[in-house]
């Protein structure tokens, strides 16, 4: 029907427009007219797929009309101006606004020209991560929890860990209708080696410029793991005093150290100083097994070490231990 021109008129619009729940969004729609082409626009129409009637119309003489006047507004179209910009602003976005919209120009002599735009209604989630404090259970339990609250669409949560383990992720409706809260637990068998280490929760969402990383420092409560250091198997008579150290790893921290021997209380040449045991010089050989007993809130554990002070060739004036 239209006469031949240098090029057809084109309706320009993005295929998809994101908008945030509760906010306003502009659906952009423009008529592009090639240089030598003439066109005259009499009506701009917006309609939604699957709904009867049009939601917004701008008429050359009647001006704008809206199905929901408080929520819709033509951004640029004005009476008495060329109707080339049909962009429509929507206020107070709702979940149910998500869908396909058609922007249509009624033109002469080309006829009607339209384009479809998909409106995505997003909700930016709030993200938190927290440690799940655990004890040595001997079986897999959650050690960290990552929650992405009120996202639309649901956020995607992944974990990064060198400790092994596996995620357990679930979804529940968010506070606002149409939003989703995603909860992800990091599950592993607790051990003392895990305590104090970190895992990272990575939350991805369309509304984020880049993924959000939340680091969780793990807490595993365990009774003391005890060892005694300071003895090198080369202690001799007439050497300087030496020190044994009771090395304890525990969570919570040790509350007490108790030194003894397999024979009972400490001999006179051994003096307990908290985690350390001072061994004074002796004048005759000894063969004693020392016990360090460490206590924390979860219990007590001990370590034993047999010390021999031998007759021998102590030529250098060093102590019984190199400590």
């Amino acid at each position: 029907w239209p006469p031949p021109g240098t090029g057809d008129i084109i309706v320009q619009a993005p295929t998809q427009v994101p908008g945030f729940l509760g906010d306003s969004v502009t659906l952009p729609c423009y008529l592009q007219v090639p240089g030598m082409e003439e066109t005259h626009v009499s009506q701009l129409t917006w309609s939604r797929h699957g709904e009867s009637g049009s939601m917004a119309v701008f008429h050359q003489t009647q001006g704008p009309n809206y199905s929901e006047p408080k929520r819709l507004e033509f951004v640029a179209a004005r009476l008495g101006t060329e109707l080339r910009d049909a962009s429509l602003r929507m206020f107070g976005l709702r979940v149910e606004d998500e869908g396909n919209y058609t922007c249509l120009f009624v033109t002469f002599p080309q006829g009607s020209r339209s384009v479809d735009i998909w409106l995505r209604v997003l909700a930016k989630p709030q993200n938190t991560a927290e440690v799940q404090k655990v004890q040595l259970t001997g079986k897999p339990v959650p050690v960290a929890r990552c929650v992405s609250t009120g996202g639309r669409p649901p956020a995607h949560i992944t974990w990064h860990s060198d400790l092994g383990g596996m995620p357990n992720t679930s979804q529940a409706p968010g506070f606002l209708s149409g939003t989703v809260t995603v909860t992800s637990l990091w599950i592993l068998v607790p051990s003392s080696q895990v305590d104090g280490k970190s895992v990272t929760c990575k939350v991805e969402h369309e509304s984020f410029e880049k993924p959000q990383l939340l680091t969780v420092n793990l807490t595993v409560y365990y009774p003391p793991e005890v060892s005694i250091s300071g003895y090198d198997n080369n202690w001799y008579l007439s050497q300087n005093e030496a020190t044994l150290t009771c090395d304890a790893r525990s969570n919570p921290e040790p509350t007490g150290y108790n030194w003894s021997t397999t024979m009972g209380p400490l001999p006179p040449f051994a003096v307990a100083q908290g985690a350390q045991l001072l061994i004074r010089p002796v004048d005759k050989p000894i063969n004693t097994t020392f016990i360090c007993n460490v206590t924390n809130a979860l219990g007590a554990r001990q370590a034993e070490l047999t010390v021999q002070v031998k007759e021998g060739p102590p030529s250098e004036p060093s102590g019984m231990s190199s400590n």
Partner: antibody, heavy 116, light 107 residues
Framework: EVQLVQSGSELKKPGASVKISCKTS????????MHWVRQPHGKGLEWIGG????????SYNQRFKGRVTLTVDKSTSTAYMELSSLRSEDTAVYYC?????????WGQGTLVTVSS | DIVMTQSPSAMSASVGDRVTITCKAS??????VAWYQQKPGQPPKALIY???YRYSGVPDRFTGSGSGTDFTLTISSLQAEDLAEYFC?????????FGQGTKLEIK
């Protein structure tokens, strides 16, 4: 007030041509497309074509196979429709109508009778 | 061409009645439909554009609805002055086409 005033009735013989005028007032002539619609007596409406006064762009109903010519005179804000090779079935009331997608203002109509 | 089929072609109703005229398009025309009222001896008068929007000055007893292929003009409470013929028209694509009309008589 927008007004579209058409020329008077015409009686034509088959094979002849007729040219109807539509003089407008009350609005800017060059801002609106002018269309032509006809209505045989007691029958429905039939779109003939339209013209935009600015550059003279036109669109015609192919049914009229080149028998119709639409023109404008911007100096007098008048639109014209010429229909040639008239036949008896062209007998109808011819309307000019201002186009706003739909037709918001119409002329009073011009009766064209084609009879031998 | 898009065919606009109107029904009924004629009807009579009493003052105060609710009157419904339908128009079916042979293909999807979106909401590019207008309704006109034509009184005897007069040119048509635009009532509705874009399927559901009333022209200023048109009484609110006239309501248009529909999209796609099915359209309705409703007169909620018929008045004596509504005696006329009513036409639908599509302006989605060329050639623009009209329904054959519905002649409304007052009982």
């Amino acid at each position: 007030e927008v007004q579209l005033v058409q020329s008077g009735s015409e009686l034509k013989k088959p094979g002849a041509s007729v040219k109807i005028s539509c003089k407008t007032s009350g609005y800017t002539f060059t801002e609106y497309t002018m269309h032509w619609v006809r209505q045989p007596h007691g029958k429905g409406l039939e779109w003939i074509g339209g013209i935009h006064p600015n550059q003279g762009e036109t669109s015609y109903n192919q049914r009229f196979k080149g028998r119709v010519t639409l023109t404008v005179d911007k100096s007098t804000s008048t639109a014209y429709m010429e229909l040639s090779s008239l036949r008896s079935e062209d007998t109808a009331v011819y309307y000019c109508a201002r186009w706003t997608g739909d037709f918001d203002y119409w002329g009073q109509g011009t009766l064209v009778t084609v009879s031998s | 061409d898009i065919v606009m089929t109107q029904s009924p072609s004629a009807m009579s109703a009493s003052v105060g009645d609710r009157v419904t005229i339908t128009c079916k398009a042979s293909q999807n025309v979106g909401t590019n439909v207008a309704w006109y009222q034509q009184k005897p001896g007069q040119p048509p008068k635009a009532l509705i554009y874009s399927a559901s929007y009333r022209y200023s000055g048109v009484p609110d007893r006239f309501t248009g609805s529909g999209s796609g292929t099915d359209f309705t003009l409703t007169i909620s409470s018929l008045q004596a002055e509504d005696l006329a013929e009513y036409f639908c028209q599509q302006y989605e694509s060329y050639p623009y086409t009209f329904g054959q009309g519905t002649k409304l008589e007052i009982k």
